[in-house]
């Protein structure tokens, strides 16, 4: 008959918690990869694509060895919230143009949201300081043209792909230290 009401739950194994977060991150990374392939196939666009509103990549090689769990989770959550906002914006602003990618974009948004909730849960289970609510971000301006929106889609998916690789690397390294 479980613990009495009001008593704290037995804390789960932090390595197992971290492991499940890594796996969810990797499955989101695979979704992102598949969607990027589709985007490149249907809307080819050479060269680098940048979007000033996207977060800058969190990590460099030297810093990876000195990572601390609170800073990784905090930064990852902030960056993924930004990407979630950008994916939502993309779906709204480019609905008709990106219709062929719509089911996958919707799935990506759902999984991104799920990963964010998992990160929040992990932070509370590990008793890490909770962040204050994010201040409302300024609205993203609609793309100037269909082509501008497609370039934005390339930038968003490319940045998300790289951010998720950084996240997996950081979390796996941290897991070995727990």
């Amino acid at each position: 008959p479980g613990p009495p009401p009001g008593s704290p739950r037995a804390s789960p194994d932090p390595r197992a918690e971290l492991d499940s977060t890594v796996l969810l991150t990797r499955s989101l990374l695979e979704d992102t990869r598949q969607l990027t392939i589709q985007l490149k196939d249907k809307f080819p666009a050479d060269g680098d694509h940048n979007l000033d509103s996207l977060p800058t990549l969190a990590m460099s090689a030297g810093a990876l060895g000195a990572l601390q769990l609170p800073s990784v989770l905090t930064r990852l959550r902030a960056d993924l919230l930004s990407y979630l906002r950008h994916v939502q914006w993309l779906r709204r602003a480019m609905g008709s143009s990106l219709k062929t990618l719509e089911p996958e974009l919707g799935t990506l948004q759902t999984r991104l949201d799920r990963l964010l909730r998992r990160l929040q849960l992990l932070m509370s289970r590990l008793a890490l300081p909770q962040l204050p609510p994010d201040p409302p971000a300024p609205p993203l301006a609609p793309p100037s043209s269909t082509w501008g929106g497609i370039r934005a889609a390339h930038a968003i998916l490319g940045g998300l792909h790289l951010t998720l690789d950084w996240a997996v690397r950081g979390l796996l390294l941290l897991k070995t230290r727990l």
Partner: antibody
Framework: EVQLVQSGAEVKKPGASVKISCKAS????????MDWVKQAPGQRLEWIGD????????IYNQKFTGRATLTVDKSASTAYMELSSLRSEDTAVYYC????????????WGQGTTVTVSS | DIVLTQSPASLALSPGERATLSCRAS??????????IHWYQQKPGQAPRLLIY???NLESGVPARFSGSGSGTDFTLTISSLEEEDFATYYC?????????FGQGTKLEIK
């Protein structure tokens, strides 16, 4: 054509170091990780580690931590693996391989570099 | 580390026959909708070649006679009708955790 071309065979004495290069062409270097795999005679293939060219951040198999060093030269689209404190068990073919980000499967391989460690 | 065990160690078949190669993992390598098992072919003096990734996805340029299946701990590579060029050693590899590890291989020989 996507290609990985590795440096030539090496013969080294025990205790020495070896540095192998792997030149990538035919794809955007930063879009994939570069992994390194060892194949010793009669042994299983063994993953040494990988590096993300954009971040420059290597991850190592604990078995090779401290002896293997992975680096990249982005401007030359070239990855390097240095193995130090060589011993006879390091005699093997070493492959570089292109890896999907954070998935660790390898869709393009170099031709392999034979390293022989012998006194 | 996860240990992969391949069976049989060697298999002698004739061209045109069906080949079934098995790979068993010491713990589940499937989760969150993906199975982290990949299959490679290697011929003497050559580098391995990716055939199947994430358990069942055929790598670009690989003939459709190759297929992969399975989940959890048991996986299979099937070659529906063997061609002369298919006689080689086949390795499975997992990437569920770090480090990724490989099976010991199955050598497919001409009968």
């Amino acid at each position: 054509e996507v290609q990985l071309v590795q440096s030539g065979a090496e013969v080294k004495k025990p205790g020495a170091s070896v540095k192998i290069s792997c030149k990538a062409s035919g794809y955007t270097f930063r879009d994939y990780n570069m992994d390194w795999v060892k194949q010793a005679p009669g042994q299983r293939l063994e993953w040494i580690g990988d590096i993300n060219p954009t971040i420059g951040a290597p991850i190592y198999n604990q078995k090779f931590t401290g002896r293997a060093t992975l680096t990249v030269d982005k401007s030359a689209s070239t990855a390097y693996m240095e193995l130090s404190s060589l011993r006879s068990e390091d005699t093997a073919v070493y492959y570089c391989a292109r890896g999907e980000l954070a998935h660790w499967y390898f869709d393009v391989w170099g031709q392999g570099t034979t390293v022989t460690v012998s006194s | 580390d996860i240990v992969l065990t391949q069976s049989p160690a060697s298999l002698a078949l004739s061209p045109g026959e069906r080949a079934t190669l098995s790979c068993r993992a010491s713990k589940s390598v499937s989760t969150e909708g993906y199975s982290y098992i990949h299959w490679y072919q290697q011929k003497p003096g050559q580098a391995p070649r990716l055939l199947i990734y994430l358990a069942s996805n055929l790598e670009s340029g690989v003939p459709a006679r190759f297929s992969g299946s399975g989940s959890g701990t048991d996986f299979t590579l099937t070659i529906s009708s063997l061609e002369e060029e298919d006689f080689a050693t086949y390795y499975c590899q997992h990437s569920r955790d770090l480090p990724p590890t490989f099976g010991q291989g199955t050598k497919l020989e001409i009968k």
